[in-house]
């Protein structure tokens, strides 16, 4: 199909930066000023994409690629190619329709994004609470009960070797 | 405006050379394919050379290896320079400018006016 396609079309064969001008007998034109072509081809070329607000340019458009968007200090980009900017909080806050909101007792967040998620319950996995849990970091489990237990060893002692050739004593 | 001025034509003996020029302006010719082609008295236009703006060439198969087809993207021109010429490569050279870059099947955009190639003894 390709094949087909570009022995049909007379725009094939323009490079990506240029589009196929029908104004002009489609001979391949430059991309004006503020817009790109990523890929040969092309009718016409994309509008640049503008960096305002909330968001800063992290990379430049040129004839060939968009331009690429993060956000300013105090927030952080969601979505794909960063389609939208949302609030920073503190560790161990969420963000809310109110605001930034601390994380209710018994969950966390250490990021500066993100929502407020439960600590970890050691006991079911048989363990026990080693370092409690704050606001801004989960739990920290330490070994269950059992393997504390006087006698109780978390090594098993390897079974003597045997020397090949000899019968055991 | 586009335009195709063709220069570098003449009277030449059969087995001679000569390089024809084809200065370009009014449109970004070096994202673009050029060509030329000859027509010889009574009969059709047809296909000479074309080079892409990427230097890939296509030549007609009477004249690959006597013709080379180059171009110069700072001097905004396309040669042609013609090698062990023939009586049957009489004809007006004209320059075109292609449609969308392309050498495969081309198809012109623009024409220059063309220069006369006469070869006789």
């Known amino acids: 199909f390709e094949r087909t396609r570009s022995l049909q079309d007379p725009c094939s064969n323009c490079p990506a930066g240029t589009f196929c001008d029908n104004n002009r007998n489609q001979i391949c034109s430059p991309c004006p000023p503020n817009s790109f072509s990523s890929a040969g081809g092309q009718r016409t070329c994309d509008i640049c994409r503008q960096c305002k607000g909330v968001f800063r340019t992290r990379k430049e458009c040129s004839s060939t690629s968009n331009a690429e968007c993060d956000c300013t200090p105090g927030f952080h980009c969601l979505g794909a190619g960063c389609s939208m900017c949302e609030q920073d909080c503190k560790q161990g806050q969420e963000l809310t329709k109110k605001g930034c909101k601390d994380c209710c007792f018994g969950t966390f967040n250490d990021q500066k994004r993100g929502i407020c998620r439960p600590w970890t319950n050691c006991s079911l996995d048989g363990k026990s609470v080693l370092v409690n849990g704050t606001k801004e970091r989960d739990v920290v489990c330490g070994p269950s009960p059992a393997d504390l237990s006087p006698g109780a060893s978390s090594v098993t002692p390897p079974a003597p070797a045997r020397e090949p050739g000899h019968s055991p004593q | 405006e586009v335009q195709l001025l063709e220069s570098g034509g003449g009277e030449v003996q059969p087995g001679g050379s000569l390089r024809l020029s084809c200065a370009a302006s009014?449109?970004?010719?070096?994202?673009?394919?050029m060509g030329w082609y000859r027509q010889a008295p009574g009969k059709r236009r047809e296909f000479v050379a074309a080079?892409?703006?990427?230097?890939?060439?296509v030549y007609a198969e009477s004249v690959k290896g006597r013709f080379t087809i180059s171009r110069d993207n700072a001097k905004n021109t396309v040669y042609l320079q013609m090698s062990s010429l023939r009586a049957e490569d009489t004809a007006v050279y004209y320059c075109?400018?292609?449609?969308?870059?392309?050498?495969?099947?081309?198809?012109?955009?623009?024409w220059g006016q063309g220069t006369l190639v006469t070869v006789k003894p």
């Open positions: 080079i892409e703006s990427g230097s890939n060439t």
């Open positions: 075109g400018l292609l449609k969308g870059n392309r050498v495969v099947s081309p198809s012109v955009a623009y």
């Open positions: 009014g449109f970004s010719f070096s994202i673009n394919a």
